[in-house]
């Protein structure tokens, strides 16, 4: 992602010959979008519609319960992260339609694309917090009975958001607008002033902290939880656990292309064919990651329908049932109220 990770339209014969061709004029602007960009636009449109409505509904449902139900606190924070990311979509959509031209200025370039990274870090940190909560409910039920409360949950969420902001700062700082001479276009992207080491460091930190480390820890965490719950059959309800596992899985599935292409581009020269190919797929990878912003409400609804046989209740009550359920975990002779869950988010090309 050296220089700018947005590509301009192909100009066919324009830059592939060493001899002058004075008879074939080239348009100074292009009027065709690449297939990956068209797919990205379709995904963005769907994500925006589902994400805004779905997450608004989740926020509305969980906001009333967040004072007393810990599960609701988790889901509320995840929905807020997703909702914020979705708000940037119309701008990103417009930019792609205009062949990645960015007419919105420098401030918007720094803030809006960074929202998706904030969302990614907030999501994964919230998912980690929720997973830790689940782990403690299963393995330390007495501690949970004594100390686990809404206040602590809100503090954990605040810490997650704070760390997410901190991790988003590098990409925020390196985002700039550049006006290219030909084709006439203003681009919004990252510029590391040709410091490849810094660029690689940012990409590696993002991959490790936003993907590999959470993948490892969450896999271990849920392996232990599932082994315990299956072996002892001690959990009266695994509804929330199933939802959380689905959300965590979707997070990693939809973030994978963005993370892989990002790390590859940071190690490639910007003029190399592989870099240029990956660059063309950048918007598609971002849009794929953005699916995280709308997938969680879908998971909740599907889970709600599955638990209830068929959709007999209204959507809000169905969501309330999934998102604010207090599952009882039996360990030894103690009973502990528990709640758990999470959402996943995405990022945008930085």
């Amino acid at each position: 992602m050296n220089s700018f990770n947005y590509t301009t339209p192909d100009y066919g014969h324009y830059d592939d010959k060493d001899t002058l061709d004075l008879n074939t004029p080239v348009d100074k602007t292009s009027n065709t979008l690449r297939v990956p960009d068209i797919l990205a636009l379709v995904i963005f449109a769907v994500v925006f519609l589902v994400g805004v409505l779905g997450n608004a509904l989740v926020v509305w449902v969980t906001a009333f319960e967040a004072k007393r139900t810990i599960n609701a606190i988790w889901f509320l924070n995840l929905a807020v992260a997703d909702f914020l990311s979705c708000l940037a979509l119309p701008i990103l959509f417009t930019s792609i339609v205009q062949h990645h031209h960015w007419p919105f200025g420098g401030a918007a370039c720094s803030i809006l694309p960074s929202l998706i990274l904030l969302n990614m870090y907030a999501s994964i940190l919230l998912l980690a917090t929720i997973s830790a909560d689940r782990f403690l409910l299963v393995f330390k039920p007495i501690w949970c009975q004594n100390f686990r409360g809404a206040g602590l949950a809100w503090i954990a969420c605040a810490v997650a958001w704070g760390l997410a902001l901190l991790l988003t700062i590098p990409s925020f700082l390196y985002r700039v607008v550049r006006e290219e001479y030909f084709p006439p276009k203003v681009l919004c992207g990252v510029d590391y002033s040709h410091d490849k080491r810094r660029e690689r460091a940012v990409a590696i930190v993002r991959l490790v902290l936003g993907f590999l480390w959470p993948l490892l820890t969450l896999t271990i965490c849920y392996t232990f939880i599932l082994l315990r719950t299956w072996s002892r059959r001690a959990t009266r309800s695994t509804k929330t656990l199933k939802v959380v596992v689905a959300v965590v899985a979707s997070f990693f599935i939809f973030w994978l292309p963005y993370q892989v292409t990002g790390i590859m581009m940071s190690f490639l020269e910007p003029s190399s064919p592989t870099f240029l190919l990956l660059n063309k797929l950048d918007s598609l990878c971002v849009s794929f990651a953005y699916i995280n912003c709308c997938i969680n409400p879908i998971i909740y609804v599907v889970a709600g329908q599955g638990f209830q046989g068929r959709l007999r209740k209204s959507l809000p009550s169905l969501l309330r049932n999934v998102l604010t359920e207090e599952s009882v975990v039996r360990e030894s002779k103690s009973f502990t109220r528990s709640t758990v869950d999470t959402m996943a988010q995405k990022t945008q090309a930085v």
């Epitope: 100009y11 324009y14 008879n23 004029p25 001479y181």
Partner: antibody, heavy 121, light 112 residues
């Protein structure tokens, strides 16, 4: 062959305006940007802006915004550069220069002979 | 704006000897399409500039093969394998990747 022929030297008073012309021949006039670059005595080159004769689209260097106007007449294959509110620092040789849009070159490839504009009271 | 810095500013060379001029940009000149729009011009005394090298290393039509260009990203070099009398003048590097187009301050090549 490509030729860019500019108008003759001008002497102007501070605060006045100057309009320099550049007549193009030997290529498809509407398919290339025309740039204006100036060079103060003993100094380097400074890009002022460009015009796309095909549709009159212009882009100016922020340093000259509000003072420079570029126009094109496709019927005579001529571009014009007008600089207003002249000051002594505007004394320079003004070049029109083609940026080729119809080949692999993608660079300013041909320059006019230059027009000396002197601003003096 | 992209600042183009040339060195040396003055280059005395013996006829037949090689010469090398360096040009450094304040930011990457790699375009989003992968090309690098860095060009070299020669302005002979009393004349308009003329294009020598375009896109880092491509010789313009009619330019002798003793002229060559190289570099990437932010660092570029123009080399003359054997300087001839007609090569005297001021050499400018220029970028057309970003707006505004910018030029180096020039390197004056003269015969010793």
């Amino acid at each position: 062959q490509v030729q860019l022929v500019q108008s003759g030297a001008e002497v102007k008073k501070p605060g006045a305006s100057v309009k320099v012309s550049c007549k193009a021949s030997g290529y498809a006039f509407s398919n290339s940007w025309m740039n204006w670059v100036r060079q103060a005595p003993g100094q380097g080159l400074e890009w002022m802006g460009r015009i796309y004769p095909g549709d009159g689209d212009t882009k100016y260097n922020g340093k000259f915004k509000g003072r420079v106007t570029m126009t094109a007449d496709t019927s005579t294959s001529t571009v014009y550069m007008e600089l207003s509110s002249l000051r002594s620092e505007d004394t320079a040789v003004y070049y029109c220069a083609r940026f080729l849009l119809i080949s692999t070159v993608t660079a300013v490839d041909y320059w006019g002979q230059g027009t000396l504009v002197t601003v003096s009271s | 704006d992209v600042v183009m810095t040339q060195s040396p500013l003055s280059l005395p060379v013996t006829l037949g000897e090689p010469a090398s001029i360096s040009c450094r940009s304040s930011q990457s000149l790699v375009h989003s399409n992968g090309n690098t729009y860095l060009h070299w011009y020669l302005q002979k005394p009393g004349q308009s500039p003329q294009l020598l090298i375009y896109k880092v290393s491509n010789r313009f039509s009619g330019v002798p093969d003793r002229f060559s260009g190289s570099g990437s990203g932010t660092d570029f070099t123009l080399k003359i394998s054997r300087v001839e009398a007609e090569d005297v003048g001021v050499y400018f590097c220029s970028q057309s990747t970003l707006v505004p187009l910018t030029f180096g301050q020039g390197t004056k090549l003269e015969i010793k």
